[in-house]
């Protein structure tokens, strides 16, 4: 279930997945929530003088049992991911951090009158993930009232330092506040030849688009369908970027589908989850557990309730069916996507809905309205 | 709600509190906004108090303590209790409330989607019940709206648990075999909602149960899809265009 409590002066021992820098425990928790395997985190708000490089360290952790041994550590804050917390799941982070320099690759320096303008500038720039603003009292005159737009490979700062008269924060694209606009176009039989930042295996272009939307550096994508000639690239979703922020003109390519990240959308941003169940499709991955249930949707629900489960397979083979139902195989992988997708199985596959929000569109099929 | 947790503001924006104002004002039942001028609830909420004038309806709230004399409330223009509902039997436990003035939809107050008649056999897996009712059988009304996720129980299985009552196709049951999570007193009339195809639907209206959250005693809800003809007939015959199909 959902566990929101934070443990002060507590550090989880072991289970390390990744370490990043975040300005506070809340942002660390958010990063853990969106990491495919992270269940627990420990954040170092205060460190001894010898370990200043560990201050603001966010240590993302996993555990087979869902818990890890706790050790006392002054200045540490630990907690759980919010993967099963429905309504509380949001990539949006509006907090501003006074006296912090969130470091990264500075790709633009502009003069702005205030922090709000600087944050808006970041929100309206394709590449900007976070920013630092130097106030008029900053010790170096040439940087005063300057807004530094930044990015990094992980989307989080490469380090964080305390510094007087600097203020830092994050882009508000994930709060649906960007004014860039979002092209919804899907280009059938087209590929973008731009820089690949990552690749994952997905069952369709829509899942590919959602993954691109929530990837820190993906601006557009190309997905190769199951009919693609190169076997090793079938069902592969290439996450892409470019210096300009726009893709080069699409190249005609049979069995390729391309499109844009929806990060800069204001209304049509997808949820960070995929609810569709794919019939006749086998999602391969590491097996977590096997249960017997009645129906693929119950299998999906079981996967959703099992916090480590990322995707599932529901088999309808007679030998996989008992009186209490058919085989529901709960699975996971390092990146949250299947390691391979094959077709023609007797059954269906789908994803966990653990990152789905509980809010919804008001578009009903049947409506009661006053004339 | 037994075994639930606090809801967040705007999480269940269709939930309303039905309150009776006699000497003092008390929360008695829940209800669901289904249109600007319409709330769907349980007929049994009005047993002994079928007088529209004494009811006050509050939407867009999370805590009952938010309600003061200044809090705007809706009044009942017309109370439509299902014509087949008999106090002595408890079937057809459904009622429509037409409000005197249309509601303004906000982030915190908006309607829930209704199922279609065709949804009568839909299998729902992600269902929640909400309300300000008791958190135990001998409890008290809660200040903060509670929510709980609860699995649906097939009618045949539900019938075995309630051999003294007829669990008919106009009812739908929900609960865990081991108990522990359920609606309770004060949650009546409120929603049982399920997320289906990415959309929340009003699947049930909290109706009754043997005690609250007892082992092998699921909650019983009025099955909304079975009453769609009635809902549409009543809302249309009351000078309202009811059916609107969206390109969802």
């Amino acid at each position: 279930g959902c566990m929101t409590q934070l443990y002060k002066n507590t550090f989880f021992r072991g289970g390390d997945l990744a370490a990043i820098y975040t300005p506070d425990a809340q942002y660390c928790q958010k990063m853990c929530t969106f990491h495919p395997r992270c269940l627990l985190f420990s954040f170092l708000a205060v460190t001894p003088p010898k370990e200043t490089n560990k201050r603001f360290g966010c240590f993302m952790k996993e555990s087979i049992t869902g818990t890890l041994p706790r050790i006392h550590r002054t200045g540490a804050i630990s907690g759980h991911s919010l993967k099963q917390c429905g309504h509380q799941i949001s990539a949006c982070h509006r907090d501003i951090y006074k006296g912090l320099d969130m470091r990264g690759s500075n790709f633009n320096i502009s003069k702005t009158d205030n922090i709000e303008e600087c944050q808006k500038l970041c929100t309206n720039n394709f590449h900007c993930q976070f920013f630092t603003y130097a106030t008029s009292a900053f010790y170096r005159p040439e940087y005063r009232k300057k807004c530094l737009l930044k990015h990094s490979a992980s989307g989080t700062p490469t380090s964080i330092k305390s510094a007087d008269n600097l203020v830092s924060g994050f882009s508000l694209k994930s709060c649906a506040l960007s004014e860039i606009g979002c092209p919804m176009d899907i280009f059938q039989h087209s590929a973008f030849a731009d820089l690949n930042v990552s690749q994952v295996i997905t069952p369709d272009a829509f899942v590919c688009r959602t993954i691109c939307t929530f990837h820190p550096n993906c601006l557009f994508f190309t997905f190769y369908t199951n009919e693609w000639e190169t076997e090793s690239q079938r069902n592969v979703c290439f996450l892409k970027t470019s210096k300009s922020g726009r893709p080069s003109p699409p190249i005609p390519q049979e069995n390729a589908i391309s499109g844009y990240s929806l990060l800069t959308c204001r209304k049509t941003r997808p949820e960070p989850c995929h609810s569709k169940i794919y019939s006749g499709v086998d999602f391969e991955g590491e097996e977590l557990n096997v249960t017997f249930v009645q129906g693929a949707d119950v299998c999906q629900e079981t996967c959703t309730k099992t916090i480590r489960c990322q995707f599932f397979i529901y088999s309808l083979l007679p030998q996989d069916c008992k009186e209490e139902g058919c085989k529901c195989s709960l699975r996971l992988s390092t990146d949250g996507s299947p390691t391979r997708i094959t077709y023609g199985m007797q059954g269906s596959s789908g994803y966990s809905l653990r990152l789905c929000k509980l809010v919804d569109s008001p578009d009903c099929t049947t409506k009661i309205n006053a004339r | 709600i037994v075994g639930g947790t606090n809801a967040s503001l705007g999480e269940w924006p269709w939930q309303v509190s039905l309150q009776v104002k006699l000497v003092s004002q008390t929360h008695l039942c829940g209800g669901s906004i289904i249109g600007r001028q319409w709330v769907l609830t349980a007929a049994h909420c009005f047993d002994g108090i079928p007088y529209p004038d004494v009811w006050r309806i509050y939407g867009g709230i999370l805590s009952l303590s938010e309600i003061t004399k200044e809090t705007p409330s809706s009044r009942i223009k017309e109370l439509i209790i299902h014509q087949e509902y008999k106090v002595s039997e408890g079937n057809y436990d459904i009622a429509l409330i037409k409000l005197q003035t249309p509601l303004n939809y906000t982030e915190f107050q908006k309607p829930i989607c209704l199922p279609s008649k065709a949804d009568t056999n839909t299998i729902y897996t992600n269902c929640w019940v909400t309300g300000w009712g008791y958190t135990k059988e001998q409890g008290e009304t809660q200040n903060i709206l509670q929510k709980a996720t609860i699995p649906l129980v097939p009618n045949e299985e539900c019938q075995k648990k309630y051999r003294d009552y007829v669990i008919n196709k106009q009812m739908i049951c929900a609960g865990y075999k081991e108990g522990g999570t359920d609606a309770c007193k004060g949650d009546s009339g409120g929603p049982l909602v399920c997320k289906h195809s990415g959309r929340w639907q009003l699947v049930g209206i909290t109706s009754w149960g043997e005690g609250c959250a007892r082992k092998d005693q699921p909650g019983v809800y009025t099955k909304v899809s079975e009453y769609m003809d009635w809902i549409l007939e009543k809302t249309q015959s009351s000078d309202v265009r009811a059916l609107e199909t969206s390109s969802a």
Partner: antibody, heavy 125, light 107 residues
Framework: EVQLLESGGGLVQPGGSLRLSCAAS????????MTWVRQAPGKGLEWVSY????????IYADSVKGRFTISRDNSKNTLYLQMNSLRAEDTAVYYC??????????????????WGQGTLVTVSS | DIQMTQSPSFLSASVGDRVTITCRAS??????LAWYQQKPGKAPKLLIY???TLQSGVPSRFSGSGSGTEFTLTISSLQPEDFATYYC?????????FGGGTKVEIK
């Protein structure tokens, strides 16, 4: 209008038998639980027995168990109470009543919403 | 068996008086309680069920409250037709049991 009319009461010797009937009208008899309640002269009310709508389930008070049998004929809209091995302490006015099972405060709740006028049974030698 | 204890057994009151009758259960019965009124030579009449729900057609001067083991029947302003005997009944578990009755007489 709901009506319940008892008959079959009278004077009977200890150890004797009597069969009470209750004719129901004005409602769908087969939908309802039915019950018998008795009241000894100058005393309070005592519940005797109940029967489910189909007649498949019956329950009795300890004081009459093994001696009284409740039954019903839904085709005739009639409830019966067969009383055997009668004792002096069985002397009472016997009422049949309809058991309503509505919903209140989210619970199913039973109550006796309509009663017959009663029939007097006197057990005396 | 659940014992139902009613008090007082007798009550003398005048027209217009506020009258309260108490019923105590020997163990918790939730809200599974009904109140009946009986006049001499007549069958009992249902007033209140589920501890507090007024039966249709019963005047609103009658009200019920309580839950668990303590219950009350209140007549806010006694009318001439209210002089009768009142019984509480638990419907929580078999055998169903009645209280001993409260006779409300004219003072």
């Amino acid at each position: 209008e709901v009506q319940l009319l008892e008959s079959g009461g009278g004077l009977v010797q200890p150890g004797g038998s009597l069969r009470l009937s209750c004719a129901a009208s004005g409602f769908t008899f087969s939908h309802y639980l039915m019950t018998w309640v008795r009241q000894a002269p100058g005393k309070g009310l005592e519940w005797v027995s109940y029967i489910s709508p189909s007649g498949g389930h019956t329950i009795y008070a300890d004081s009459v168990k093994g001696r009284f049998t409740i039954s019903r004929d839904n085709s005739k809209n009639t409830l019966y109470l067969q009383m055997n091995s009668l004792r002096a302490e069985d002397t009472a006015v016997y009422y049949c009543a309809r058991v309503a099972r509505g919903i209140a405060a989210r619970s199913r709740t039973s109550y006796f919403d309509y009663w017959g006028q009663g029939t007097l049974v006197t057990v005396s030698s | 068996d659940i014992q139902m204890t009613q008090s007082p057994s007798f009550l003398s009151a005048s027209v217009g008086d506020r009258v309260t009758i108490t019923c105590r259960a020997s163990q918790g019965i939730s809200s599974y309680l009904a109140w009946y009124q009986q006049k001499p030579g007549k069958a009992p009449k249902l007033l209140i069920y589920a501890a507090s729900t007024l039966q249709s057609g019963v005047p609103s001067r009658f009200s019920g409250s309580g839950s668990g083991t303590e219950f009350t029947l209140t007549i806010s302003s006694l009318q001439p037709e209210d002089f009768a005997t009142y019984y509480c009944q638990q419907l929580n578990s078999y055998p169903l049991t009645f209280g001993g009755g409260t006779k409300v007489e004219i003072k």
